[in-house]
């Protein structure tokens, strides 16, 4: 499958899990914290302010990078995965923490974590998809 | 208490490599980002380059055809190698780490000055 | 390369006064990407803020980051004898990593 079509597929059933996160776990437009969101590289469930959230590097990445094996489990409620089966310093694991001005940088940058670089430059304009 | 501590020869001649290791000591630490930065006299700080954990490096422009950096297989050290240093490498190199999941370096070593003549 | 201009070069106050300096970046940095340090002679530099608003552990409460996109702010509220050293801003979002040229706080 062309990696674009991946990219379309995992969008469309990132936006279906954090519609069903939200629904478990009573958030709202007005809800404080950060929205559930696709970064147009792996999925971010929605989370509370102070809350740092792990995930592994997506499926996608061993297109790009087939020799390194991640774990395919992200941290958070029901279709998100299993929170203990991810550790900080585990390779192949980016982070964001929700703060009260909304989700933090990932860390470390993608391109570290999982062995493809997400953008030309950094700094680069990002068109994330929030669903709250 | 966890320290960094940079050493190598504090004299180097024009031409030659300037070679340094950052050692942790006091505990072990897991870092994420290595990085070495460098300060000549009375000048600002300038960013050399930083090594993942990984081993993926990234170096600064104006620097990158000369330095070259590596971990050491226990972890707790890392090495910078400047090649056909000149007078203007003369500076002080400190060796600064992330090790929290966080944008920042929270530790940073005391540095040591590097002089580079003949 | 994204470059970071910090003014005043020098600022000269007394103690007790409150300190207001800046770095202008070249293009937009995220905040998650901008900290400050803090310099004294003869010394490595030591982190103050991280996240352009976020203090370090042990960082007395005088000291506050704020601002966004392309201009910041690093604000000491009432200058102690033990503040007046160079302070340093820095970006992580873009490769090289890039420092401000420093601004100095000397004593009045």
């Known amino acids: 499958m062309h990696s674009d079509c991946i990219f379309k597929k995992e969008q469309a059933m990132c936006l279906e899990k954090i519609q069903r996160a939200n629904e478990l776990m009573g958030f709202n437009d007005s809800s404080p914290g950060c929205p559930g969101m696709w970064d147009n590289i792996t999925c971010w469930k929605p989370a509370h302010v102070g809350e740092m959230v792990l995930v592994s590097c997506p499926e996608l990445f061993r297109i790009f990078n087939p020799d390194q094996v991640w774990e395919t489990e992200t941290i958070g409620e029901s279709d998100f995965g299993d929170s203990n089966s991810l550790d900080l310093s585990d390779m192949g694991v980016v982070s964001r923490n929700c703060t009260e001005d909304g989700w933090s940088e990932p860390f470390p940058h993608y391109f570290d974590a999982c062995g493809f670089d997400e953008y030309e430059s950094e700094t680069g304009d990002q068109d994330y998809y929030y669903l709250s | 208490q966890v320290q960094l501590q940079e050493s190598g020869p504090g004299l180097v001649k024009p031409s030659e490599t300037l070679s340094l290791t950052c050692t942790v000591s006091?505990?072990?630490?897991?870092?994420?980002?290595w990085s070495w930065i460098r300060q000549p006299a009375g000048k600002g700080l300038e960013w050399i380059g930083r090594i993942y954990t990984s081993g993926s490096t990234n170096y600064n422009p104006s620097l990158k055809s000369r330095v070259t950096m590596s971990i050491g297989t226990s972890k707790n050290q890392f090495s910078l190698k400047l090649s056909s240093v000149t007078a203007a490498d003369t500076a002080v190199y400190y060796c600064?780490?992330?090790?929290?999941?966080?944008?920042?370096?929270?530790?940073w070593g005391r540095g040591t000055l590097v002089t580079v003549s003949s | 390369e994204i470059v970071l201009t910090q003014s005043p070069g020098t600022l000269s106050l007394s103690p007790g006064e409150r300190a207001t300096l800046s770095c202008r970046a070249s293009q937009t940095v995220s905040r998650s990407y901008l900290a400050w340090y803090q310099q004294k002679p003869g010394q490595a530099p030591r982190l103050l803020i991280y996240?352009?608003?976020s203090r370090a552990t042990g960082i007395p409460d005088r000291f506050s980051g704020s601002g966004s996109g392309t201009d910041f702010t690093l604000t000491i509220s009432r200058l102690e004898p033990e503040d007046f050293a160079v302070f340093y801003c820095q970006q992580f979002g873009s490769s090289p990593w890039t420092f401000g040229q420093g601004t100095k706080v000397e004593i009045k």
């Open positions: 600064a780490i992330i090790a929290s999941r966080g944008w920042y370096f929270d530790l």
């Open positions: 996240g352009a608003s």
């Open positions: 006091g505990g072990s630490i897991s870092s994420y980002y």
